[in-house]
């Protein structure tokens, strides 16, 4: 007896973080035997969408001409072959930016910091929000969350980094969000360039740390040390 049909692959172009009003295409790739593709969105009535396969039948295109709140969320796709439906794909999380006004990102005491010292990146929003995200450009794992512990909303979140090394240097942006949808983010803050001077140490991870040997410092999640500020916010690593 044949096993279950292999699960399809699901991805988004140009990416899974899309600004409000921009177009995005979701692709689901299955097998050449596929007769129909189905896309389901978490917490929405199913099926979310159905498409016939494109030749040579191993994938389907789901188009979103203009990104809005309705489309933000977690998706899975399936395909139907003559022997039945496939396993679901791994989930795709489609995030919309531009749902709220942009926060302000600053560095305290300064964006120019000496290696070994401390710096705190401060993300401030005009209206109270309960989730703040710090993004570092060109990092493989760019997201650092600070989320309110009990739904108490804040106007700001602090991201302390200590001790600073050359790995911390680079361009940062932050976003704010409401907990009722983690898929809706604010406009991005203006970029902040963090410049680390006087770095003499080797920035590579030491052998005692349990990281993949194939991973360089830019492939590691941003993990500042120091205590979480007493603001009711809790740190989450993505």
């Amino acid at each position: 007896q044949a096993g279950p049909l292999p699960k399809p692959t699901l991805w988004a172009e140009p990416g899974s973080v899309i600004s409000w009003g921009n177009s995005v295409t979701i692709w689901c790739q299955g097998t050449l035997e596929a007769r129909e593709y189905r896309l389901d969105k978490e917490e929405s009535p199913a099926p979310w969408d159905r498409q016939n396969p494109l030749e040579p039948k191993n994938k389907a295109r789901f188009s979103i001409p203009s990104m809005t709140e309705d489309y933000a969320g977690r998706y899975r796709c399936y395909y139907r072959s003559p022997v039945g439906w496939s396993q679901p794909s791994d989930p795709l999380e489609l995030v919309m930016t531009g749902a709220y006004s942009k926060p302000t990102l600053s560095a305290l005491p300064s964006p120019l910091v000496t290696s070994g010292k401390s710096v705190t990146l401060l993300c401030q929003s005009r209206s109270p929000m309960d989730t703040f995200l710090l993004i570092k450009e060109r990092a493989a794992h760019p997201l650092l969350h600070l989320r309110s512990e009990h739904g108490a909303q804040q106007h700001q979140a602090e991201f302390p980094m200590s001790p600073v090394t050359s790995v911390h240097g680079g361009t940062y942006r932050c976003f704010s969000s409401h907990g009722f949808s983690h898929y809706l983010l604010s406009h991005p803050s203006d970029p902040l360039e963090l410049i680390v001077s006087g770095s003499l140490e080797d920035p590579r991870p030491s052998p005692t740390r349990s990281v993949s040997t194939a991973a360089g410092p830019e492939d590691q999640p941003l993990m500042p040390t120091g205590s979480v500020p007493h603001s009711g916010l809790r740190r989450h690593w993505e």
């Epitope: 929405s44 009535p45 199913a46 099926p47 969408d49 159905r50 309705d70």
Partner: nanobody
Framework: EVQLVESGGGLVQPGGSLRLSCAAS????????MGWYRQAPGKQRELVAA???????KIGDSVKGRFTISRDNAKNSVYLQMNSLRAEDTAVYYC???????????????WGQGTQVTVSS
């Protein structure tokens, strides 16, 4: 061939209840989200409620807490239970079927003919 057939409309007093039914062909019912739109004179068509093949529902903001939607897989039918009816609920109610994204785009694949609901004392 009529593929969606509505019934249950009529005249009801404010505060009253009605139950709309929509019968669908098996091929449509088994693979689609089923739902209801309404259109009042001179107004835009409005999505009232929808229910997916696994039973997950979405209810429009204007009727939340008053209307519920359900589907009966054995009868290939979908029902809209309308309680605490108000004058502003007066409209033609249409049964519809399709993928949910097309409900949001107001372009389901299948439409019924509509049934009139009038709320008046």
């Amino acid at each position: 061939e009529v593929q969606l057939v509505e019934s249950g409309g009529g005249l009801v007093q404010p505060g009253g209840s009605l139950r709309l039914s929509c019968a669908a062909s098996e091929s449509i019912f088994s693979s689609n989200v089923m739902g209801w739109y309404r259109q009042a004179p001179g107004k835009q068509r409005e999505l009232v409620a929808a229910v997916g093949i696994q039973g997950l529902t979405k209810i429009g903001d204007s009727v939340k807490g008053r209307f519920t939607i359900s589907r009966d897989n054995a009868k290939n039918s979908v029902y809209l239970q309308m309680n605490s009816l108000r004058a502003e609920d007066t409209a033609v109610y249409y049964c519809a079927a399709g993928a949910y994204v097309r409900f949001l785009q107001y372009s389901p694949d299948y439409w019924g003919q509509g049934t009139q609901v009038t709320v008046s004392s």
